[in-house]
């Protein structure tokens, strides 16, 4: 799978994680920090 960094305009899209662009799927994706979930890593779980 080819990935690259998200465009600058997506800065802040992932609240607790890193935004990556999945080139083959034409999708931005939030890779969440440990303890966070959700489309934008907005939910904390214990």
């Amino acid at each position: 799978v080819s990935i690259t960094k998200c465009n600058s305009d997506m800065n802040g899209y992932c609240l607790h994680g890193q935004c990556i662009y999945l080139v083959d799927m034409s999708q931005n994706y939030c890779r969440c920090e440990v303890g966070y979930t959700g489309v934008r890593c907005e939910h904390f779980y214990l």
């Epitope: 305009d9 802040g12 034409s26 999708q27």
Partner: antibody, heavy 116, light 106 residues
Framework: QDQLVQSGAEVKNPGASVKVSCKAS????????IQWVRQAPGQGLEWMGR????????KYREKFEGRVTITADTSTNTAYMELSSLRSEDTAVYYC?????????WGQGTLVTVSS | DIQMTQSPSSLSASVGDRVTITCKAS??????IAWYQQKPGQAPRLLIQ???TLQPGVPSRFSGSGSGTDYTFTISSLQPEDIATYYC????????FGGGTKVEIK
């Protein structure tokens, strides 16, 4: 399926304000950004600004700063674009556009006519 | 704001011709460019995103290329149904559309 349904056509007097709504269904606007784009008759496409409904953060094109306000109501899954101090040059079709995880998905457009 | 200079503003070509449209950005946009087709009275239709990724259902005669500040959109063999106005859009930093290219049949 995902949809962005915009409010109906408006006719406004010069100097007035207009507020266009954009109701989302099939997805949560908190997962997206909502952009606004306009197109005057016979003219090109012009980006106006956008909102991050989750953070309630906005970005506007410089030329619209102070005259446009983009808001979002996450409880009704609806975004709004309000343009004030209308002039004849603001006559255009206004589109809301979803961006975020997937690339752009457009509403059907709302014609705003400014005429005395 | 990033400026997008699109050329030509209009062109006339024969059915079967190769048509090329260019967009030049005022700074590096890291391949974050899309191409739209718009026919009169219709909303824009997304053809290509991320420089060269064709949208599902878009004919393979449409293609895109480029990097840095210089990008190209090509119709390899112009068809009557391709008569429309085409716009580039940079979405690396905020958004800026090119001025559009009106494509007509000779």
């Amino acid at each position: 399926q995902d949809q962005l349904v915009q409010s109906g056509a408006e006719v406004k007097n010069p100097g007035a304000s207009v507020k266009v709504s954009c109701k989302a269904s099939g997805f949560n606007i908190k997962d997206t950004y909502i952009q606004w784009v306009r197109q005057a008759p016979g003219q090109g496409l012009e980006w106006m600004g956008r909102i991050d409904p989750l953070r309630r953060q906005t970005k506007y094109r410089e030329k619209f700063e102070g005259r446009v306000t983009i808001t979002a109501d996450t409880s009704t899954n609806t975004a709004y674009m309000e343009l004030s101090s209308l002039r004849s040059e603001d006559t255009a079709v206004y589109y809301c556009v979803r961006s975020g995880r997937e690339f752009d998905f457009w509403g059907q457009g709302t014609l705003v006519t400014v005429s005395s | 704001d990033i400026q997008m200079t699109q050329s030509p503003s209009s062109l006339s070509a024969s059915v079967g011709d190769r048509v090329t449209i260019t967009c030049k950005a005022s700074q590096d946009i890291h391949k974050y460019i899309a191409w739209y087709q718009q026919k009169p009275g219709q909303a824009p239709r997304l053809l290509i995103q991320y420089t060269s990724t064709l949208q599902p259902g878009v004919p393979s005669r449409f293609s895109g290329s480029g990097s840095g500040t210089d990008y190209t959109f090509t119709i390899s063999s112009l068809q009557p149904e391709d008569i429309a106005t085409y716009y580039c859009l940079q979405y690396d930093n905020r958004r800026t559309f090119g001025g559009g290219t009106k494509v007509e049949i000779k």
